[in-house]
Interface confidence: medium
Amino acid sequence: GITIPRNPGCPNSEDKNFPRTVMVNLNIHNRNTNTNPKRSSDYYNRSTSPWNLHRNEDPERYPSVIWEAKCRHLGCINADGNVDYHMNSVPIQQEILVLRREPPHCPNSFRLEKILVSVGCTCVTPIVHHVA
Amino acid sequence: GITIPRNPGCPNSEDKNFPRTVMVNLNIHNRNTNTNPKRSSDYYNRSTSPWNLHRNEDPERYPSVIWEAKCRHLGCINADGNVDYHMNSVPIQQEILVLRREPPHCPNSFRLEKILVSVGCTCVTPIVHHVA
């Protein structure tokens, strides 16, 4: 395995699956240094590519509730407030790390999992495919 | 804390910090159920609120490198390809979970951390404040 300049206070891992299984402190530290980050909660209505938020809940996952964005229109809202189909509303997707209880229903054993979520929508110029 | 119907096969945690400290399997499972998620790699250029990606590196964090979106313009790109300052490019932000080595330099002990990242930008109608 890797040799790291070792802190003498490091815990030992006697787990047979080490180093696949590690100890994680769930006392989550919030590194959002800006104490009042501008919350993007109203952007979903004000955007030219507006979106709705859908609740995705899974009690075996941490975080158990994830809000997913779904673009309201195929096109984008123009200056007149109408949908312009010459432009496209597309979801901005992001992979996030979550914890899944494994085995299921175990309160202190998890597996890291990667899931893809749509965070919001943006308006893009379409890619036009010209047929020869 | 939460009471979970306990699976008899659950590992025990003898850790004095239980249930704050849990075992996590790092063999990351990919739950992207859509077998071909559209990677949004070109949206940052095609958007009417385009963004650049900036590198943020921290060797004590996983993932160690996070590329953050920064909107290119205050305004949005109009149909003529010019910046329209009657509209605003704004970042869409999302909290993500990362793992931090804790204590520092320990290879098998981590703390979950929440950080706010800008995933991309969207074009919004500005909020106009009328001065009386």
Partner: antibody, heavy 126, light 107 residues
């Protein structure tokens, strides 16, 4: 600029072991993984195994399990690959390659090999 | 293990011509496929990652497409310096595997 510099060519006898090093510079060592890929003369590329530096996780291809040991030393930013029980079939160029642990444009981009070492020729001959 | 099959094995092409190399995976690998170029006596070099994402410093004539099991590397307007062997590589499942390679030479 990221660079991976490997140790020099080796000539070994059958049954011996070889240990190849890969010194990394540029970028945070814990921020990526190192894989080892070999190429026999006139042949294609074959993945042997790799280490995720941040977690110290090592994965090996089944074919090499028990014969190969991959380690890394964060203090010297060097990864090592040791292959034992050498036979003439192990004559090859051995490459180390970097796997980024990056969160790029919304995705965990962790599995492409974005930088490669210059290669180490290992010749096994009696 | 995932088997990657490239075609053709060999291609002889005149400069400025379009080159298409395909890579077929034995099962679905989403977009976890990468393309490398290897010139004689050199290390491989990453050309395209995740099926279609371009790499900084790689000429724009190189592009990739596909998902699931079928992938394509395209060189639009081959140049003399593009001679070499091209490999696909999947990272969806361990062990990582490579295609057998496609050798491209210039007529």
């Amino acid at each position: 600029e990221v660079q991976l510099v490997q140790s020099g060519a080796e000539v070994k006898k059958p049954g011996e072991s070889v240990k190849v090093s890969c010194k990394a510079s540029g970028g945070s060592f814990s921020g990526y993984g190192i894989s080892w890929v070999r190429q026999a003369p006139g042949q294609g590329l074959e993945w042997m195994g790799g280490i995720t530096n941040f977690f110290g996780i090592v994965d090996y291809a089944q074919k090499f399990q028990g014969r190969v040991t991959i380690t890394a030393d964060e203090s010297t930013t060097t990864a090592y690959m040791e292959l034992s029980g050498l036979t003439s079939d192990d004559t090859a160029v051995y490459y180390c390659a970097r796997e980024p642990n990056e969160f790029w444009n919304g995705y965990y981009a962790t599995h492409d090999f974005d930088y490669w070492g210059q290669g180490t020729t290992v010749t096994v001959s009696s | 293990e995932i088997v990657l099959t490239q075609s053709p094995d060999f291609q002889s092409v005149t400069p400025k011509e379009k080159v298409t190399i395909t890579c077929r995976a034995s099962q679905n690998i989403d977009s976890e496929l990468h393309w490398y170029q290897q010139k004689p006596d050199q290390s491989p070099k990453l050309l395209i990652k995740y099926a279609s994402e371009s790499i900084s410093g790689v000429p724009s004539r190189f592009s990739g497409s596909g998902s699931g099991t079928d992938f394509t590397l395209t060189i639009n307007g081959l140049e003399a310096e593009d001679a070499g062997t091209y490999y696909c590589h999947q990272s969806a499942f361990l062990p990582y595997t490579f295609g057998q390679g496609t050798k491209v030479d210039i007529k």
